[in-house]
């Protein structure tokens, strides 16, 4: 989970026509027998808001103190407000449970903007809107933060649900799905139907808006439309995954495939925005001004700065181009492509000088720590994290938004050679992972 | 040029109350973490308390917890320690400590440098 | 609690000998180690954080090694002025705790 720009995300469900909802195609024998199926009590479960991040209940201690905590696919620590703070409403009250156990061991946790420091133990937890289950899990209690809560953003804490090895202060913590899994006889495997909303929301909308799904155990059917395509997790520390080529409106970038995985790939619910090293940045930016040239837009735009605004329902969606990035698919030689549109990497923000206009952000910016796939990728898809089978799955999300001449894709096969070599081997030293920087 | 001085220590029985202060200047004191570490004459160390730099984080020996209270006043530039249930052990040279940074907790955050240290004495 | 274990206790040396001061940890401190160098009546002052980093403005003679539960600090040519106690002390869990020290002599 990357600062960078690397915080939180956005709500409201808005899926298509019914329509315009694909028709679906089974493929049975590529997944396992009871994964399958239905997890009503689990669908809506996620809320959030336009940058600020998805989020789940959860309660912790006993008697349950119930809060509203992040969800996020990269990083490994689950961590809580443990003392009062400006931006919380509430906090973990360690004193008042009677389940609290303390690690006597402090945490600190940097990531590009914003850290936080606390005091590690173990206490019961539970996700109301999610498996029946209590496990005892660690948690980091926060004391001291800095950039890191966000005013109204109605969350408390973060549910890093990467792997071990990133966790703080060290690979030692297990992280709350390893406790899960190993507790119970919840699958090792869950989902993501993040809804991004399409239009900004007032404060008001936005508290009452479902922001989308987290199906812990399984994957539920109803979230997505078409096959499930999956590409490997590369390494058990991030969600990484191995991009092999980028399209903007179907014109390949022609780089070098290492290039797009400099220094690595991740797949990211913690961060907003699609993130690019600066090279690929530059060359995407280059193609899709291009691409949307019969409109001018100032620098400070494709800079992720300045907000562009039209008038209530004009917005030009057909000038800008759909971005396409090609996965690593499970069989040698073969991938698979997801295709965004610019409904997801347009980001309406509420612009109060303007309220009769649909304004936004341009949601793909630059890192200097590789590519991010965060909530404007994720957004558009149903995204299944197989830890079980070490594989990650992309399928056309049944709330994703669009309009009445394109819509998100994920096709597949297509062929591509030496898939091997579009991987970046990071330099082995002791401070490779020290600082998780988010965007 | 960093500069920590201790004051407030005496001769107290046991059962009574200290306060300690330290006074410190030539750093922007909010943004450093600060700490109490005390020495029994021809002893070793013992880490007593120690607090972030917004007084967030704090952290207390086991020997203490209870009956010591770290605390800052940011406008005044000071850090207090304020000494209750005083017990004979308690007795030694009690030094102020500016920490790395406004953390805790964080790597490389350690303390540095130390005020000269001001004596309490618990005796009857 | 993480007991400290420095070795020797005392270490007689001659002016531009090498010193190699050993720590040792009763469980994994990973690499929240650093050593402290105290001169008689006076503040305790930082040499080495982290396990091996050097504190600014310390001399290039000293290091510091180890992670986990063995550490080492090597002062590689004595000075007069190197002549003290050095403490290691821990980070990694509460209480953090310091070790008895070793006391480096002229011999």
């Known amino acids: 989970t990357h600062l960078g720009i690397r915080l939180p995300l956005r709500s409201g469900l808005a899926g298509p026509p019914l329509g315009l909802r694909l028709p679906r195609e089974t493929d049975e024998e590529s997944e396992e027998p009871g994964r399958r199926g239905s997890f009503v009590e689990m669908v809506d479960n996620l809320r959030g808001k336009s940058g600020q991040g998805y989020y789940v209940e959860m309660t912790v201690g006993s008697p349950p103190q119930t809060l509203n905590i992040l969800v996020d696919t990269g990083s490994s620590n689950f961590a809580v407000g443990a003392a009062p703070h400006p931006f919380l409403h509430r906090y973990y009250q360690r004193q008042l449970s009677s389940t609290y156990r303390d690690l006597r061991k402090g945490v600190y946790v940097p990531y590009t903007q914003g850290k936080w420091e606390g005091e590690l133990g173990t206490d019961l937890v539970s996700i109301p809107h999610g498996p029946n289950v209590t496990v005892r899990a660690n948690i980091a209690a926060i004391t001291e933060s800095d950039k890191f809560f966000i005013n109204g953003s109605n969350w408390e804490g973060i549910l890093g649900l990467a792997y071990a090895e990133i966790a703080r202060p060290d690979d030692s913590l297990e992280p709350f799905f390893d406790s899960l899994v190993k507790q119970t006889h919840i699958p090792n495997i869950f989902s993501l139907q993040l809804c991004g909303a399409g239009f900004p929301l007032n404060q008001t909308e936005a508290l009452a808006s479902v922001g989308g799904s987290m199906i812990i155990g399984g994957i539920d059917h109803s979230l997505y439309t078409g096959r499930l395509w999956y590409t490997p997790i590369r390494r058990e520390w991030y969600y990484e995954v191995i991009i092999v080529r980028v399209e903007i409106n179907g014109q390949d970038l022609k780089m070098d495939c290492k290039e797009y995985n400099y220094d690595k790939s991740i797949v990211d619910s913690g961060t907003t925005n699609l993130r690019l090293p600066k090279k690929v940045f530059e060359a995407a930016v280059k193609s899709i001004k291009a691409a949307s040239s019969t409109e001018k837009f100032p620098d400070g735009f494709w800079l992720g700065e300045q907000l562009v605004c039209w008038q209530a329902g004009t917005t030009p969606w057909n000038i800008f181009p759909v971005i396409s990035l090609y996965l690593m698919g499970e069989v040698t030689n073969q991938s698979f492509r997801i295709t965004i549109l610019p409904q997801q990497y347009l980001r309406p923000v509420e612009d109060v000088a303007t309220s009769q206009d649909d304004c936004y952000k341009f949601a793909v910016s630059q890192s200097s720590t590789g590519t991010v796939m965060g909530a404007v990728i994720m957004e558009g898809f149903y995204v299944v994290f197989d830890r079980a089978r070490k594989r990650i799955g992309f399928a056309v999300s049944a709330c994703h938004v669009h309009d009445e001449f394109r819509t998100a894709a994920v096709e597949g096969p297509f062929v591509t050679a030496d898939m091997e070599d579009c991987g970046y081997n990071i330099p082995q030293t002791d401070e490779s992972t020290l600082m998780t920087g988010r965007a | 040029e960093v500069q920590l001085l201790e004051s407030g220590g005496g001769l107290v029985q046991p059962g009574g109350s200290l306060r300690l202060s330290c006074a410190a200047s030539?750093?922007?004191?909010?943004?450093?973490?600060m700490g109490w570490v005390r020495q029994a004459p021809g002893k070793g160390l013992e880490w007593v308390s120690a607090t972030s730099g917004s007084g967030g984080s704090t952290y207390y020996a086991d020997s203490v917890k209870g009956r010591f209270t770290i605390s800052r006043d940011n406008s005044k530039n000071t850090l207090y320690l304020q000494m209750n249930s005083l017990r004979a052990e308690d007795t030694a040279v009690y030094y102020c400590?500016?920490?790395?940074?406004?953390?805790?907790?964080?790597?490389?955050?350690?303390?540095?440098?130390w005020g000269q240290g001001t004596l309490v004495t618990v005796s009857s | 609690e993480i007991v400290l274990t420095q070795s020797p206790a005392t270490l007689s040396l001659s002016p531009g000998e090498r010193a190699t001061l050993s720590c040792r940890a009763s469980q994994s401190v990973s690499s929240y180690l650093a050593w402290y160098q105290q001169k008689p009546g006076q503040a305790p002052r930082l040499l080495i954080y982290?396990?091996?980093n050097r504190a600014t403005g310390i001399p290039a003679r000293f290091s510091g090694s180890g992670s986990g539960t063995d550490f080492t600090l090597t002062i590689s040519s004595l000075e007069p002025e190197d002549f003290a106690v050095y403490y290691c002390?821990?980070?990694?869990?509460?209480?953090?705790?310091f070790g008895g020290g070793t006391k480096v002599e002229i011999k």
């Open positions: 982290d396990a091996s």
């Open positions: 400590a500016k920490g790395g940074s406004q953390w805790l907790y964080a790597p490389g955050s350690w303390f540095d440098p």
């Open positions: 030539g750093f922007t004191f909010s943004t450093y973490a």
């Open positions: 002390v821990q980070r990694s869990n509460f209480p953090w705790t």
